[in-house]
């Protein structure tokens, strides 16, 4: 049996960013059993977590991580130094900044060590797995009468990322959402004076750096409006 | 800290062409992002054009199909050709470098302009 499995997962390019491999078997046997797919995320160029969902296997079993990096420097063969279990079973493994090459193809190799022909190996393309930290400090200034400025910081160059600011009133049942682009401020041109406003933010590693389609958490959400807006009129920032 | 060294501006007439270079006291290896920005007097700095490790690269729209954002890494040196100038192109640009998460360095400027 060899097989090879091309799957999506939500980060295609013009070449897959995805794919697995098993080795092939002279009879079948534990070794055909598929292993579970790794999914990756960088979180915010920190660190990494690489996870498998252990409990896909028909028994308990401690399979081993190995990664490298495709056509670089860094092509020779490293072991998972840092497992994530899983009810005392390996179901990770996490990689800090030193060992994340953002820009080179990352091979990641699942194993199972009892099986050492038992073994699937997947490429990524981990500047499509970036995930930011959530925006921070949003700040509101009033431009005028009937205009707010929202302001935010994130910790991360300001360039690679895009958000996305949603805010309501208190008396919208939905909320209305605004794409923004690397520069990280949003205009809201008419405010009624007599509502209290809520807005919120969260970013992604796209599209000048990378093309990442997971958005960070939302921010803390930041009020304005009926019953805070006379105690500043050109500055107010409450966090909920 | 990285040290980025601009050079190449000076005067063209506009359909001229220029070509920028920065200059990085690290190895390109070492870095993720770098990019070319501009200002023009009273503005804020804009970006331009920007090449990330695997030599993606993006192009602000009022310069795409004119100028092409490039890296040597043999010779440690980033690029910015620039063709069709045009009067409104006239600004200081400055090269920057972006290590993830937040690290960013910038260049002294290099002034370029463009009149007849």
């Known amino acids: 049996l060899n097989t090879t499995i091309l799957t999506p997962n939500g980060n295609e390019d013009t070449t897959a960013d995805f794919f697995l491999t098993t080795m092939p078997t002279d009879s079948l046997s534990v070794s055909t059993l598929p292993l579970p797919e790794v999914q990756c995320f960088v979180f915010n160029v920190e660190y990494m977590n690489c996870t498998w969902n252990s409990s896909s296997e028909p028994q308990p079993t401690n399979l081993t991580l190995h990664y490298w990096y495709k056509n670089s420097d860094n092509d020779k063969v490293q072991k998972c130094s840092h497992y994530l279990f899983s009810e005392e079973i390996t179901s990770g493994c996490q990689l800090q900044k030193k060992e994340i090459h953002l820009y080179q193809t990352f091979v990641v190799q699942l194993q199972d060590p009892r099986e050492p022909r038992r073994q699937a190996t997947q490429m990524l393309k981990l500047q499509n797995l970036v995930i930011p930290w959530a925006p921070e400090n949003l700040t509101l200034h009033k431009l005028s009468e009937s205009q707010l400025e929202l302001n935010w910081n994130n910790r991360f160059l300001n360039h690679c990322l895009e958000h996305l600011v949603q805010y309501r009133t208190d008396w919208d049942h939905s909320w209305t959402e605004q794409s923004v682009d690397y520069r990280h401020k949003f205009s809201l041109p008419s405010v009624d004076g007599q509502k209290r406003y809520t807005f919120r933010v969260r970013s992604r590693f796209n599209p000048l750096c990378g093309s990442a389609q997971h958005w960070s958490e939302w921010s803390h959400p930041i009020h304005w409006g009926s019953n805070t807006s006379k105690e500043n009129p050109f500055l107010f920032a409450l966090e909920a | 800290e990285v040290q980025l060294v601009e050079s190449g501006g000076g005067w063209v007439q506009p359909g001229g062409s220029l070509r920028l270079s920065c200059s990085p006291s690290?190895?390109?290896?070492?870095?993720?992002?770098m990019g070319w920005y501009r200002q023009t007097p009273g503005k804020e700095r804009e970006w331009v054009a920007t090449?990330?490790?695997?030599?993606?690269?993006h192009y602000e729209n009022s310069v795409k199909g004119r100028f092409t954002i490039s890296r040597d890494t043999a010779k440690n040196m980033v690029y910015l050709q620039m063709n069709s100038l045009e009067p409104e192109d006239t600004a200081v640009y400055y090269c920057n470098a972006g290590i993830l998460p937040r690290e960013e360095y910038w260049g002294q400027g290099t002034l370029v302009t463009v009149s007849s």
């Open positions: 690290e190895r390109l290896s070492s870095i993720d992002i």
């Open positions: 090449i990330t490790g695997d030599d993606t690269t």
